[in-house]
Interface confidence: medium
């Protein structure tokens, strides 16, 4: 069937359109184009005779039409009046005619739109704004954009006038945005420039910063005021209702108690005509005096005296605080606070109570600290220590002994030999000693303030022959795989070599054996039961040598995993069950049995006469070593077969 296709269907003014003919019949004589939906000679545009290839313009020809041999019609430089229907009349050789109608629409190219507004400075929560998209254009669609996005759904937004007008009711500061309008028709789309809506708002209730309302006398007061507002607010300050200045910040240096009062900030928006105020109450406190500590005893004696520390001055309705060693007071039965916390009493002072101590007075703003106070606790003397620790010396050497005892004030020292006073010095020196210098050497320490004295006695032996040494131990019953043992060869002697033997042989090389203190101390780390041997130490010098008696190490170990014997697990009914449990352990362990989880007797041997299949089950032996604190156990299954059945069958 003959059809006409318009390419394009929607045509912009000034462009061209092609009326394309489809299914043109064969054996044609010619054809003619007409404006409109029917063949009308008055509205003929152009005719075409195929045989002569002659095109003849008609009354409706405008000079912009071109006809092609395939009957298609091109119309150039389209104008608005070209809109409508076009009819093709085809004359065939048999003089039978055919007709077909096509159409197209003409639209103008849209100009760039612009936005007009009925209110350039609307007031928040009061005014409405109507935006209109200009110009008004026929057959155009109007669209709106807010911040380059399509319009949000809002009851305050209304489109009217064919969407050409956008009205914002009761504008808010959040409506301050970029607005654009767009016009569209089938052949073009144009978007306007942005219009920024300038909403007047505020001022909101001002905020005064900083928030603190308490100040100390002598500080600077610096208050700042801010209120959200468009245009920006103008600020005024009032103190106790009296106008001060028209600034956003209020600064008063070196304030006094007289500056206490109500501070009002007023924000004013000249465009909206609105005022808002905020009031803050400022309190200025007088500077309290710096506290100090008094003591009822400046030189207390350890374990005898109490000390009462008092925080001065006494101020009514004040909180007193205490610190010891820069920390809050520890909980101690020896520390007592008075009801008002002003007095801290130390009962039965010790040398560790020296401090420093601080007290504080708390006011509304801060805590004022006193200077630290140190207690001078009188103590000691403790038992004196005589050094060096040697007790054996060879003739001809110099004897130099020093004595020290912890004491406050420092102790005064005296030396006695065999009870006879020698000298009042901390050190005792005797040159080129002989065997006659052997004896009891006593150091006496005296504290003149407390009146206390303490003594220590040391036996000094001067001999060319070395004494028989002995072995001391720091642990007489070490636990296997847990404890270490340190053997020390006594006595400590100058210019002496120390030697060790284990089971009569020199020390084996082992990472668990360590010699120290000039080989005088032998340490066994992580002892094992194999360390239970005879240990001998020896001393020698250029003149003589001697060995100690052997010391046998008693290592506590076990209990190891026990063994239940006999190993049989199958028995015949009627037999006697006699199970023995053994575990390697030092000391010997305690034994107990459980059958099927039920505790039985506390013996090494479990005996059950004439067993039956009821005696089937689990037999557990438990071993416990009270010395090592360790336990162990083993479980064994026993199967009792009825007489005459083969072992291993279950009951």
């Amino acid at each position: 069937k003959l059809t006409i296709e318009s390419t394009p269907f929607n045509v912009a003014e000034g462009k061209e359109v092609l009326l394309l003919v489809h299914n043109l019949p064969q054996h044609l004589f010619g054809y003619s184009w007409y404006k409109g939906e029917r063949v009308d000679g008055n509205r003929q545009i152009i005719g075409y005779v195929i045989g002569t290839q002659q095109a003849t313009p008609g009354p409706a020809y405008s000079g912009r039409e071109i006809i092609y041999p395939n009957a298609s019609l091109l119309i150039q430089n389209i104008i608005q009046n070209d809109t409508g229907f076009y009819t093709l009349h085809v004359i065939k050789s048999d003089l039978v005619n055919e007709e077909a109608t096509g159409q197209f629409r003409v639209y103008p190219e849209l100009p760039k739109p612009s936005i007009s507004s009925n209110n350039s400075k609307p007031v928040e929560d009061k005014d409405a704004v109507a935006f209109t998209c200009e110009p008004e254009t026929q057959d155009a669609t109007y669209l709106w954009w807010v911040n380059n996005q399509s319009l949000p759904v809002s009851p305050r937004l209304q489109l009217s006038n064919g969407n050409r007008t956008l009205t914002l009711f009761n504008v808010t500061r959040n409506d301050t945005a970029s607005y654009k309008c767009e016009t569209q028709n089938p052949v073009s789309a144009r978007r306007s420039d942005s219009v920024i809506l300038n909403v007047l708002y505020g001022p909101d209730a001002p905020t005064i910063s900083p928030l603190n309302t308490s100040y100390r006398s002598g500080e600077n007061l610096n208050l700042s005021c801010h209120a959200a507002s468009n245009p920006p607010a103008q600020y005024s300050w009032f103190v106790n209702g009296t106008f001060q200045q028209s600034t956003q910040e209020l600064f008063i240096p070196n304030i006094t108690v007289n500056n206490s009062g109500s501070y009002t900030c007023q924000a004013h928006n000249s465009d909206t005509g609105l005022n808002r105020t905020t009031v803050t109450t400022i309190t200025v406190y007088a500077e309290p005096p710096k506290p100090f500590i008094t003591s009822n005893n400046s030189n207390p004696v350890e374990d005898e005296d109490a000390v009462a520390l008092t925080c001065e001055p006494e101020i009514q309705n004040t909180t007193y605080l205490w610190w010891v060693n820069n920390q809050s007071l520890p909980v101690s039965p020896r520390l007592q606070l008075s009801n008002d916390n002003r007095t801290l009493t130390l009962l039965s002072v010790t040398r560790n109570d020296v401090g420093p101590y601080e007290c504080g007075i708390q006011n509304e703003l801060s805590v004022d600290h006193s200077d630290p106070v140190i207690l001078n606790v009188l103590y000691g003397p403790d038992d004196p220590t005589i050094s060096p620790s040697y007790t054996y010396y060879r003739p001809g050497v110099n004897l130099s002994l020093s004595c020290h005892a912890a004491s406050n004030p420092p102790a005064q020292y005296s030396w006695l030999i065999d009870g006879n006073i020698q000298q009042h010095t901390q050190e005792l020196f005797i040159s080129n000693i002989t065997e006659k210098n052997s004896g009891l050497y006593t150091c006496q320490a005296n504290n003149s303030a407390s009146g206390h004295s303490r003594t220590t006695v040391k036996t000094i032996t001067v001999s060319a022959e070395l004494p028989k040494p002995s072995i001391s131990s720091n642990n007489s019953k070490p636990v296997e795989d847990k404890d270490a043992v340190a053997f020390t060869c006594e006595p400590e002697a100058q210019n002496t070599t120390y030697l060790w033997w284990v089971n009569g042989q020199s020390l084996p090389v082992s990472p668990r054996l360590q010699l120290s203190n000039g080989n005088r101390t032998l340490t066994l780390f992580n002892v094992t039961r194999n360390d239970a041997r005879a240990y001998v130490c020896g001393i020698q010098n250029s003149v003589s040598a001697n060995r100690s008696d052997p010391v046998t190490l008693d290592v506590l170990y076990g209990p190891d995993t026990p063994i239940i014997s006999p190993p049989d697990s199958s028995y015949l009914s009627g037999a006697n069950l006699n199970l023995s449990c053994h575990s390697a352990s030092n000391p010997s362990p305690q034994y107990s049995w459980r059958i099927n989880g039920i505790p039985q007797q506390h013996t090494q041997v479990l005996f059950i006469a004439k067993i039956t299949p009821n005696n089937n089950g689990t037999y557990a032996c438990f071993v416990s070593n009270l010395a090592t604190g360790r336990n162990n156990s083993i479980v064994k299954s026993i199967t009792v077969s009825a007489s005459g059945t083969s072992p291993g069958l279950s009951a």
Epitope: T561, R594, N596, G597, G617, T618, N632, I634, V635, T639
Partner: nanobody, 122 residues
């Protein structure tokens, strides 16, 4: 610790059957024996049946031929098939597990369940 969860107790008529089960969970190195004990009101706890890892069984005389104990080692679960139940079987039935905690069979420990009530009554 080892936790034991017992299920399957309840009320049954004389001559009826029940099959309670008990599942062990927690730090089990090796379960050696699993079993059931019971305690009737006013009486001492007594062994009902047990089964060891090496298939040693033990039954109380009063349940032989009626009760069968079985064990699923993979699930650490023990079952007690109770047939031909009698009123004197009424008791709280406790699951019992015996564990060993190292390769040398040393360190034996017992664990007990909370108990499940079995009531045989017409």
């Amino acid at each position: 610790q080892v936790q034991l969860v017992e299920t399957g107790g309840g009320l049954v008529q004389p001559g009826g059957s029940l099959r309670p089960s008990c599942t062990a969970s927690g730090s089990i190195f090796s379960i050696y024996a699993m079993g059931w004990y019971r305690q009737a009101s006013g009486k001492q706890r007594e062994l009902v049946a047990l089964i060891t890892r090496d298939e040693v069984f033990n039954y109380a005389d009063s349940v032989k031929g009626r009760f069968t104990i079985s064990r699923d080692n993979a699930k650490d679960t023990v079952y007690l098939q109770m047939n031909s139940l009698k009123p004197e079987d009424t008791a709280v039935y406790y699951c019992w597990v015996e564990t060993v905690n190292d390769h040398y069979n040393s360190g034996v420990e017992d664990y007990w369940g909370q108990g499940t009530q079995v009531t045989v009554s017409s």
